[in-house]
Interface confidence: low
């Protein structure tokens, strides 16, 4: 992937209106679209204060983390799903372009070198607190999770990293 | 329904110290999922952020850098309100003097917006 | 420091639609507000998080944040909404994260 494909907010803008969709069409479902289980999933709210105040290494780890979290947690749906006969066919679609999105999104993010931030220097790792998670039990909640993640902690972080590649 | 309520004298002298407290209603000064702001409002400045307190297990506060080495922002939780001190005042001071609520860690989506806010206090430095 | 621009102000006939802009560097990759502020009344939000509307604020009302610039868009507009409208962004706590203002007037 271009290296800064990520820091033209029009790709990011992209991914977040497919997640704001497919949290539309899941908040219509009986039950939200009860995935039959509890899957773990990162905590996406962010304290504004907290993050401008600690370095750009932790930030790294929490986005790296999350985005793997969250994929995770979106095959293992997409996993469910296949095997529930209970739940709309249309649902596939959006569980499908999450998958293939966050996919996309952890190349541009490798590109943008959240990778190596991440991991190095290890003092940022390890002195990060363990990534704070929830739990998500419905196709619902986790669309939701996916949004606020992109346009918080995601948004965040790509805005602060592009801006140092700028200087 | 949060509601805020603004005290504090409408005039003060050059060089010395303005002083205006904030009164909560249908929340906690100590609240986790809260921030409690200053903010004025002047036709020269515009409207400018001043300072938040905040309480996360323990109190934070940010200030602007244009009155950081001038302002202090303290919580009374015994009262549930909060105050705005800003010393060594100016004409340059003379402004609306709003409090107001965010919520940078509670809904996600509202991390800076500023939902709640106090009716305003004008405050004019002169001698 | 972050510097958030808007037009002075912005004129539109009733049942019209009014945008109004706020440019800022990088801006679509920080969340913006906007705030309605009637004369001798604290402002209001209107709009938070790029596009979405507080509860009690009408649909007529939207945002949206993509590049430097902000807009909000207010639709049928009506005499009521004559008033002063200032972006905001939580691009750094530190530094001033109100727009200017822009004074919409409604005529006729």
């Known amino acids: 992937a271009p290296a800064r494909l990520i820091c033209d907010s029009r790709v990011l803008e992209r991914y977040i209106l497919e997640a704001k969709e497919a949290e539309n069409v899941t908040m219509g479902c009986a039950e939200g679209c009860s995935l039959g289980e509890n899957i773990t999933v990162p905590d996406t709210k962010v304290n504004f204060h907290h993050w401008k105040k600690s370095e750009a290494g932790r930030h790294a780890v929490e986005v790296w983390q999350g985005l793997a979290l969250l994929s995770e947690a979106m095959l293992r749906s997409q996993a469910l799903l296949a095997n529930s006969s209970q739940l709309p066919e249309t649902l596939q679609v959006h569980v499908d372009k999450a998958v293939s999105g966050l996919r996309s999104l952890t190349s541009l993010l490798r590109a943008l070198g959240v990778q190596k931030e991440a991991v190095s220097p290890p003092e940022a790792a390890s002195s990060a607190a363990p990534l704070r998670t929830v739990a998500a039990d419905t196709l619902c909640k986790l669309f939701r999770i996916y949004s606020n993640f992109l346009r918080g902690k995601l948004k965040l972080y790509t805005g602060e990293a592009c801006r140092r590649g700028d200087r | 329904q949060v509601q805020l309520q603004q005290s504090g004298p409408g005039l003060v002298k050059p060089s010395q110290t303005l002083s205006l407290t904030c009164a909560i209603s249908g929340d906690s000064v100590s609240s986790n999922t809260a921030a409690w702001n200053w903010i004025r409002q002047s036709p020269s400045r515009g409207l400018e952020w001043l300072g938040v307190i905040y309480y996360r297990s323990k109190w934070y506060n940010d200030y602007a850098v244009s009155v950081k080495s001038r302002i202090t922002i303290n919580p009374d939780t015994s009262k549930n309100q909060f105050s705005l001190q800003l010393n060594s005042v100016t004409p340059e001071d003379t402004a609306v003097y709003y409090c107001a609520r965010s919520v940078p860690g509670g809904d996600p989506g509202l991390e800076h917006a500023f939902a709640y806010w106090g009716r305003g206090t004008l405050v004019t430095v002169s001698s | 420091s972050y510097v958030l621009t808007q037009p002075p102000s912005v004129s539109v006939a009733p049942g019209k639609t009014a945008r109004i802009t706020c440019s800022g560097d990088?801006?679509?990759?920080?969340?913006v507000e906007w705030y309605q502020q009637k004369p001798g009344q604290a402002p209001v939000l209107v709009i938070y998080d790029d596009s979405d509307r507080p509860s009690g604020i009408p649909e007529r009302f939207s945002g949206s944040n993509s590049g430097n610039t902000a807009t909000l868009t207010i639709s049928r507009v009506e005499a009521g909404d004559e008033a002063d409208y200032y972006c905001a962004s939580f691009a750094s706590w530190s530094d001033s994260v109100f727009g200017g203002g822009t004074k919409l007037t409604v005529l006729g």
């Open positions: 990088n801006l679509g990759t920080y969340y």
